[in-house]
């Protein structure tokens, strides 16, 4: 079977600072030198791109400067961090991996990670 499989955790709870991290791991059917990783958010059957990065195997993963994502790569594993999350961002975050080069191209889509975000309670006023 030449399909590419992608694994990611089913559930992640964001920190009180609105940061969520999870690992996206893929079983590569080929020897890719160029890989693209995309995080998609699925809510109410609408799919939107959260962030994307292309990297050369052995090099670091670099998202655009204004991206809410950061990440590191190690072999066939990508550690993804999404920042600035609020309660309204709770949803299913899907890891999509594409082996861009050399041919043939392969696509891998994970089942998604449900990220729960709870907005922190405002701090009560203090006399101190």
């Amino acid at each position: 079977c030449k399909a590419m499989h992608v694994a990611q955790p089913a559930v992640v709870l964001a920190s009180s600072r609105g940061i969520a991290s999870f690992v996206c791991e893929y079983a590569s059917p080929g020897k890719a030198t160029e890989v693209r990783v995309t995080v998609l958010r699925q809510a109410d059957s609408q799919v939107t791109e959260v962030c994307a990065a292309t990297y050369m195997m052995g090099n670091e993963l670099t998202f655009l400067d204004d991206s809410i994502c950061t990440g590191t790569s190690s072999g066939n594993q990508v550690n993804l961090t999404i920042q600035g999350l609020r309660a309204m961002d709770t949803g299913l975050y899907i890891c999509k991996v594409e082996l861009m080069y050399p041919p043939p191209y392969y696509l891998g889509i994970g089942n998604g990670t449900q990220i729960y975000v709870i907005d922190p309670e405002p701090c009560p006023d203090s006399d101190f």
Epitope: C1, K2, A3, M4, R36, V47, M100
Partner: antibody, heavy 118, light 108 residues
Framework: QVQLVESGGGVVQPGRSLRLSCTAS????????MDWVRQAPGKGLEWVAV????????YYADSVKGRFTISGDSSKNTLYLQMNSLRAEDTAVYYC???????????WGQGTLVTVSS | EIVLTQSPGTLSLSPGERATLSCRAS???????LAWYQQKPGQAPRLLIY???SRATGIPDRFSGSGSGTDFTLTISRLEPEDFAVYYC?????????FGPGTKVDIK
Amino acid sequence: QVQLVESGGGVVQPGRSLRLSCTASGFTFSSYGMDWVRQAPGKGLEWVAVIWYDGRNKYYADSVKGRFTISGDSSKNTLYLQMNSLRAEDTAVYYCARGGLLGGFDYWGQGTLVTVSS
Amino acid sequence: EIVLTQSPGTLSLSPGERATLSCRASQSVSSSYLAWYQQKPGQAPRLLIYGASSRATGIPDRFSGSGSGTDFTLTISRLEPEDFAVYYCQQYGSSPFTFGPGTKVDIK
């Protein structure tokens, strides 16, 4: 809303060249793979070529490799297919299509007819 | 290259009947990477199903997809007059992307 509009089709002699264009609107061009698919008269669908994201990666069907070149201009939101050394068997309606974020071709143009005949 | 075969070539049915279309792959296709399209004469194809079983935006729930490995099925639970068309399956998990030859659903 998303729209794809092809142009550039017509009648051309074998061995000659033609360039097809596909103007996209309603989405960010560089976030999607863009494909060309063709359909010979009375036949099924045949995938022709794809270009991804920043335009560096392009793949082709064996039947057109070395003769056709796919390219894109994200500033104009336009996809192109340069077709050289055309053959009678390239006669078809050519569609441009957007690769959906989760796969499949989710939007298609109306198609442009290319007829290769002497 | 993954070769897709579709059966039957033509399916003659009446409105209100159930249509079952088959798509078989020459090698295993992960279910995440199989799509179904509908095409009517003189029109562009329309995406019905992606990921073998997920309906595309705006597709009525009488269309459903299933299957895994090498065998996939598109089911139309009750045929409406506008459903008589040609249906294609496609794999997009690896290049070259390939389509099946199509199944024509026509009115009996």
